[in-house]
């Protein structure tokens, strides 16, 4: 902490500009103003601080706002937002998309920070659901933030908010979230017809029943392997070898090259050696 | 609730064939959703996975044993069973039988009984 | 084959302590990763399978988390009787492997 000094004459600053970048951290402390700093918030990226400077500039609004900031603060943080400590940001309250976004852009490209994961978890309790625009934002900065959420909290998302979901997005989710997010899905896409449902529930399907697989063995298909190998064991393992023809048409060829991994070795385990035979790929049960 | 039970000798002499048996009570051998594994540690070391079987009869063994090792399951006895050929003092081990259910894992395991190989 | 790499192969703690030991799979196993605690001249007991779902009966201070490569098994306070030797084990591929061990010593 900076010790308490009086600010030189002359020294006293009368707005935020680059002048400031030579004075030492007491005279930061002496003589910028925390209320004029509040109000110039949007310059303070412009200007080349030190670290040490911007320790400076935050004990002086932590001074100013004890309660934790405003929002037209907060909203001009830029990258004093990288001092900010979880416990700094579960004081703020932000209602703000735009103000969301600044502080998402500043932490661009490095993995999600404590206090990135704070930011967000505040502002979408703040909000009381994962609205399509926050999730169209949070994905776009983070494509894995979906599969970072507990299951608890995906049961927040709106089956609204799913046609925001791209299939990259879903890449880490294990069976328990996807087994909340595939009836969301569903009720999402209920009206798409067939061939088209079936692209944009594909990535979903790790938390389908067997009667949807069943269903889907049906429609011509043709499930790539990749999605097979996604789907949870429960579900696949009721399904009949005739059903997985069905429902993999050409790609069912890749059963061989999986048959040592599951669902793939589990489901092959408990079919009769007759009806594997049937797939001509050489698969021992 | 299902428990296992394995029983066979404690000691073996070198390059013959130590045999085990495990017995399972409180359950069937027959479970759909199970499969029945030999895993053994060595003293002071690790864990490592022998194979496993169906009560089909179907089999998949560590690739580094399979040469030496069968595993077969009698039904009717509720019970399935371990046979290493080719002992030497490496075998000398703790050999657990563990079931596998497919949507956990080894969720069951037997006390272990220790196998010793030694002339 | 899979093989599992575990670290470290033994830390000491104190009751109390947040304890994370983790589990690197030389190729993807998805999300397949169950964790073992064995203590001394007993059978290891399952904790968490699926890498992340907790066993029934174990206690929710056992916690697990990771996809693909990199696993996690965290112990937010470590209790009296948790310290023992944790195995990770990949059930995805056919080998069946398990990790090398993490022995949880008393500081």
């Known amino acids: 902490e900076v010790e308490k000094t009086a600010c030189p004459s002359g020294k006293k600053a009368r707005e935020i500009d680059e002048s400031l970048i030579f004075y030492k951290k007491w005279e930061l402390e002496a003589c910028v103003d925390a209320a004029l700093l509040a109000t110039q918030m949007d310059r303070v990226n412009a200007i080349p601080f030190t670290y040490e400077q911007l320790d400076v500039l935050k004990h002086k609004l932590d001074e100013l706002y004890p309660q934790g900031y405003p929002e037209s603060v907060i909203q001009h943080l830029g990258y004093l937002f990288l001092k900010m400590s979880p416990e700094d940001i579960r004081k703020w309250n932000v209602t703000s998309l735009e103000t969301l976004k600044a502080l998402l852009e500043v932490n661009k490209g490095h993995e999600m920070s404590p206090q990135v994961a704070t930011l967000i978890d505040r502002f979408v309790k703040g909000r009381g659901q994962l609205d399509k625009d926050t999730l169209d934002t949070l994905t776009a900065f983070y494509p894995g933030y979906l599969c970072s959420l507990s299951p608890e909290e995906l049961s927040s998302v709106p089956p609204s908010s799913i046609w925001a979901v791209r299939p990259q997005d879903l890449d880490t989710c294990d069976p328990r979230q996807l087994d909340v997010l595939y009836p969301k899905a569903r009720l999402a896409f209920q009206n798409m017809n067939g061939s088209e449902y079936f692209v944009k529930i594909q990535s979903f399907l790790g938390g389908a029943p067997t009667e949807d697989l069943k269903a889907l063995s049906q429609q011509n298909v043709s499930m790539d392997l990749a999605t097979f190998m996604k789907l949870r064991t429960d579900a696949v393992l009721p399904l009949t070898v005739a059903e997985v023809q069905k429902l993999l048409g050409p790609h069912v060829e890749g059963l061989k090259a999986e048959e040592r991994h599951r669902p793939v070795r589990d489901w092959i385990l408990r079919q009769r050696q007759d009806d594997l035979d049937t797939l001509g790929l050489g698969l021992q049960g | 609730q299902v428990q296992l039970q394995e029983s066979g000798p404690g000691l073996v002499k070198p390059s013959e064939t130590l045999s085990l048996t495990c017995t399972v009570s409180g359950g069937s051998v027959s479970s759909y959703y199970s499969t029945w594994s030999w895993i053994r540690q060595p003293p002071g070391k690790g864990l490592e996975w022998i194979g496993y079987?169906?009560?089909?009869?179907?089999?998949n063994y560590n690739p580094s044993l399979k040469s030496r090792v069968t595993i077969s399951v009698d039904t009717s006895k509720n019970q399935f069973s371990l046979k290493l050929s080719s002992v030497t003092a490496a075998d000398t081990a703790v050999y657990y039988c563990a079931r596998d259910n497919v949507f956990t894992g080894f969720d069951i395991w037997g006390q272990g009984t220790m196998v010793t190989v030694s002339s | 084959d899979i093989q599992m790499t575990q670290s470290p192969s033994s830390l000491s703690a104190s009751v109390g302590d947040r304890v994370t030991i983790t589990c690197r799979a030389s190729?993807?196993?998805?999300?397949?990763v169950n964790w073992y605690q064995q203590k001394p001249g007993k059978a290891p007991k399952l904790l968490i399978y699926?890498?992340?779902s907790l066993q029934s009966g174990v206690p929710s201070r056992f916690s697990g988390s990771g996809s693909g490569t990199d696993f996690t098994l965290t112990i937010s306070s470590l209790q009296p009787e948790d310290f023992a030797t944790y195995y990770c084990q990949q059930p995805y591929d056919a080998s069946y492997t398990f990790g090398g061990g993490t022995k949880v010593e008393i500081k």
């Open positions: 699926a890498a992340s």
């Open positions: 079987i169906y009560y089909s009869g179907s089999t």
């Open positions: 190729q993807s196993s998805r999300y397949y």
